[in-house]
């Protein structure tokens, strides 16, 4: 029912320009890796890589953060950079890869009963697109981040993956971010071989789960590299 969907659902990713969709074997319709929202940069293939400019972390992918590419660089020139792995230096949570957070300047695992210090954060949608609520309520969503007992369940609004329960990540859904399932073996994933090459997806997928990597499907061969289907596969 609609109520159960409103309570429990999540969103992943949308189709590319025509010809970029890769059909899932046996499927009547396409499974595909990403489309840009109006105003986003052009859909780019891996070979046509350009750094994706950003103003804040939320404009980048789940495994990226927004910063100046050079230390002490011009603050006006920021791009999406690869997230920092465990034990790497950091200045804020968003710099650390999913499943980690920034503690005392170092990325550490968020499994260690970490609770963010902020009491409340507000998501304001301002992407130049119209956002109407179905029930007429405010477009501004206040997200309580004081998650001492529960973390966001599937479909809950989030700011970053540490807001979400185990097995979920925080990924874009239209012009918000919600908790979505981390991908399992065999599921279609979005491959960003070069950071920032993805543009900004309306429906963003989570990353592949532990022990899995996003790789081209062995039996899926097409002329265009950008249109090949990627799935989560065992290392």
């Amino acid at each position: 029912t609609l109520n159960s969907v409103l309570n429990s659902n999540a969103i992943k990713n949308l189709p590319p320009p025509l010809g970029g969709a890769a059909g899932h074997p046996g499927s009547a319709v396409s499974a595909a890796p990403g489309i840009l929202y109006p105003g986003g940069n052009k859909y780019q293939t891996i070979d046509n890589y350009q750094p994706y400019p950003c103003a804040e972390d939320e404009e980048c992918g789940t495994d990226e953060y927004c910063a100046s590419p050079t230390r002490g660089g011009d603050a006006g020139v920021q791009i999406c950079l690869a997230c920092r792995k465990r034990r790497k230096r950091c200045m804020r949570h968003a710099m650390c890869c999913p499943g980690n957070y920034c503690k005392n300047g170092i990325c550490v695992s968020s499994d260690q009963n970490h609770f963010r210090g902020e009491i409340e954060e507000t998501i304001t949608e301002s992407f130049g697109n119209d956002h109407s609520t179905l029930d007429g309520y405010s477009r501004r969503t206040t997200l309580s981040s004081k998650m001492y007992h529960t973390k966001g369940q599937e479909g809950s609004v989030c700011l970053r993956s540490s807001d979400c329960a185990s097995g979920l990540c925080c990924a874009r859904h239209f012009w918000s971010k919600i908790c979505k399932p981390v991908l399992k073996e065999g599921q279609v994933c979005t491959k960003h071989r070069r950071k920032g090459s993805h543009g900004l997806e309306i429906f963003q997928r989570c990353y592949c789960g532990e022990g899995l990597s996003c790789r081209i499907q062995k039996d899926h061969h097409q002329a265009s590299n950008s249109s090949r289907l990627h799935t989560c596969q065992r290392h």
Partner: nanobody, 117 residues
């Protein structure tokens, strides 16, 4: 297997209206949101309007705001696009897209909308 079927396209004069429908069949799982996209000849596919069951919101591209209305019934696996005050620049193939809980993203084959001046 999931199938998305769009209908309602056609030839209409500028200023006219059309109502597109998209029905999903064969679904054994839930949709989290659906959207309409369009692709004009020689152009990239672009977002037109979307509806999020999860967040209870609708979304529109600036170019269609105030003219197009998206609606839907998740229980019936159906989404609609009411297009009023159509312009020649709205001419395109319109695609319906559905985002599903099985982690695949499904979308249909498209329906042609032609607006003559």
């Amino acid at each position: 297997e999931v199938q998305l079927v769009e209908s309602g396209g056609g030839l209409v004069q500028a200023g006219g209206s059309l109502r597109l429908s998209c029905a999903a069949s064969g679904r054994t799982f839930s949709s989290y949101g659906m959207g309409w996209f369009r692709q004009a000849p020689g152009k990239e596919r672009e977002f037109v309007a979307g509806i999020s069951w999860t967040l209870g919101r609708t979304y529109y591209a600036d170019s269609v705001k105030g003219r197009f209305t998206i609606s839907g019934d998740n229980a019936k696996n159906t989404v609609y696009l009411q297009m009023n005050s159509l312009k020649p620049e709205d001419t395109a193939v319109y695609y319906c897209a559905s985002d599903e809980s099985d982690a695949y993203n499904y979308w249909g084959q498209g329906t042609q909308v032609t607006v003559s001046s």
